[in-house]
Interface confidence: low
């Protein structure tokens, strides 16, 4: 599933090429271990902010399609408890490139160890 | 066609650059608050073709205490479990595309 | 408020193509998808492609061969066009635009197609 | 292509009885939607992403489910709610739609 993620973001990360959006969001540049599933949801909460004011139909859809993948992948691992991790609006914003970017590492940091 | 000012978001204010239309703006979230995660600042002057009148869009922006400034007071650590997000739910004709 | 009419031709030789226009109003075709979906008696409702607000098509691999579907954002218009047709695809051929997450929001009133020699 | 299979096929239900039509995927999906058709009109979007009524749609229509099966219920049929439903699957292409229930009135 992770890797399903992965194709997502990519092609997240085509489809706004064309477009000019301006946000900056909530982003987890350096992501502890012990904090990586609050992180994750972090993510996953911001990349609706590029849904929301992409107005792309398909953006819409491989948001919400990346979403289902991650919450899949994330609950296959049972309930894991995390403490003392930062809120998601207490993270650094950056522009989206910078957010897609670091999106992909966590992912990968779940494919590394899954 | 123009866009009247912009209504008012709770803890946030707006300096609009221009009021044409298809002119994109952004709300802040005032001193000591922060955009909630996962909702959007912005705001649009579109046009309602029905009616011939240009609105601005509803921005999905809450803006919430400033957590780093919360947790100055002593408090018990933030707990997460790996429960899922789930996508806001968007409106099926959204009001700021008519 | 959102509007979409098909316009084509109701009856098509054997073999020939099939052109149907969506014209469409009260939204932008540059934000919102539009769907094509045709229904016969014998085989019901069947979806056959959809058009992006980018540009980008997806069509059901049953008809990926010989459908096509184009737009001009600026006429508000989206262009069908299904080649070779046969006596089983008489049908009822429907717009549909696309809210989000794959929901055919607001249908055509449909334009009805019969193949006949 | 993921197959739904709606049942029953016809069915009629007197003024205020209980209606459920249920939709069965041949594998699993994320989502259903729901759509109403009268004869002669094109459908009309009743219920999206499992649950959530489209605008203007009584709120005696529910819908509920997961993985292969779905239903649609009224909680007290009416005369007005007459028509096919047909389900359809969002999760993979492409995208396809149930046979349709007739529900009629007794």
């Known amino acids: 599933n992770w890797v399903n993620v992965i194709s997502d973001l990519k092609k997240i990360e085509d489809l706004i090429q064309s477009m000019h959006i301006d946000a900056t969001l909530y982003t987890e540049s350096d992501v502890h271990p012990s904090c990586k599933v609050t992180a994750m949801k972090c993510f996953l909460l911001e990349l609706q902010v590029i849904s929301l004011e992409s107005g792309d139909a398909s953006i819409h859809d491989t948001v919400e399609n990346l979403i289902i993948l991650a919450n899949n992948s994330l609950s296959s691992n049972g309930n894991v408890t995390e403490s003392g991790c930062k809120e998601c609006e207490e993270l650094e914003e950056k522009n989206i490139k910078e957010f897609l970017q670091s999106f992909v590492h966590i992912v990968q940091m779940f494919i590394n160890t899954s | 066609i123009t866009c009247p000012p912009p209504m008012s978001v709770e803890h946030a204010d707006i300096w609009v650059k221009s009021y044409s239309l298809y002119s994109r703006e952004r709300y802040i979230c005032n001193s000591g608050f922060k955009r909630k995660a996962g909702t959007s600042s912005l705001t649009e002057c579109v046009l309602n073709k029905a009616t011939n009148v240009a609105h601005w869009t509803t921005p999905s922006l809450k803006c919430i205490r400033d957590p780093a400034l919360v947790h100055q007071r002593p408090a018990p650590p933030s707990t997460v479990t790996t429960a899922g997000v789930t996508p806001q739910p968007e409106s099926l004709s959204p009001s700021g595309k008519e | 408020e959102v509007k979409l009419k098909e316009s084509g031709p109701s009856l098509v030789q054997p073999s020939q193509s099939l052109s149907i226009t969506c014209t469409v109003s009260?939204?932008?075709?540059?934000?919102?998808?539009v769907h094509w979906v045709r229904q016969s008696p014998g085989k019901g409702l069947e979806w056959l492609g959809v058009?992006?607000?980018?540009?980008?098509?997806d069509y059901n691999a049953a008809f990926m061969s010989r459908l096509s579907i184009t737009k001009d954002n600026s006429k508000s218009q989206v262009f069908f066009k299904m080649n070779s047709l046969q006596a089983d695809d008489t049908a009822i051929y429907f717009c549909?635009?696309?809210?989000?997450?794959?929901?055919?929001?607001?249908w055509g009133q449909g334009t009805s197609v019969t193949v006949s020699s | 292509e993921i197959v739904l299979t709606q049942s029953p096929a016809i069915m009629s239900a007197s003024p205020g009885e209980k209606v459920t039509i249920t939709c069965s995927a041949s594998s699993s999906v994320s989502y259903m939607h729901w759509f109403q058709q009268r004869p002669g009109t094109s459908p009309k979007l009743w219920i999206y992403?499992?649950?959530n009524l489209a605008s203007g749609v009584p709120a005696r229509f529910s819908g509920s489910g997961s993985g292969t099966s779905y239903s649609l219920t009224i909680s007290r049929m009416e005369a007005e709610d007459a028509a096919t439903y047909y389900c359809q699957q969002r999760s993979s292409y492409p995208l396809t739609f149930g046979a349709g229930t007739k529900l009629e009135i007794k």
């Open positions: 009260g939204f932008s075709l540059t934000t919102y998808a």
């Open positions: 992403s499992t649950s």
């Open positions: 549909a635009k696309n809210g989000a997450y794959y929901v055919m929001d607001y």
């Open positions: 058009i992006w607000g980018a540009g980008s098509t």
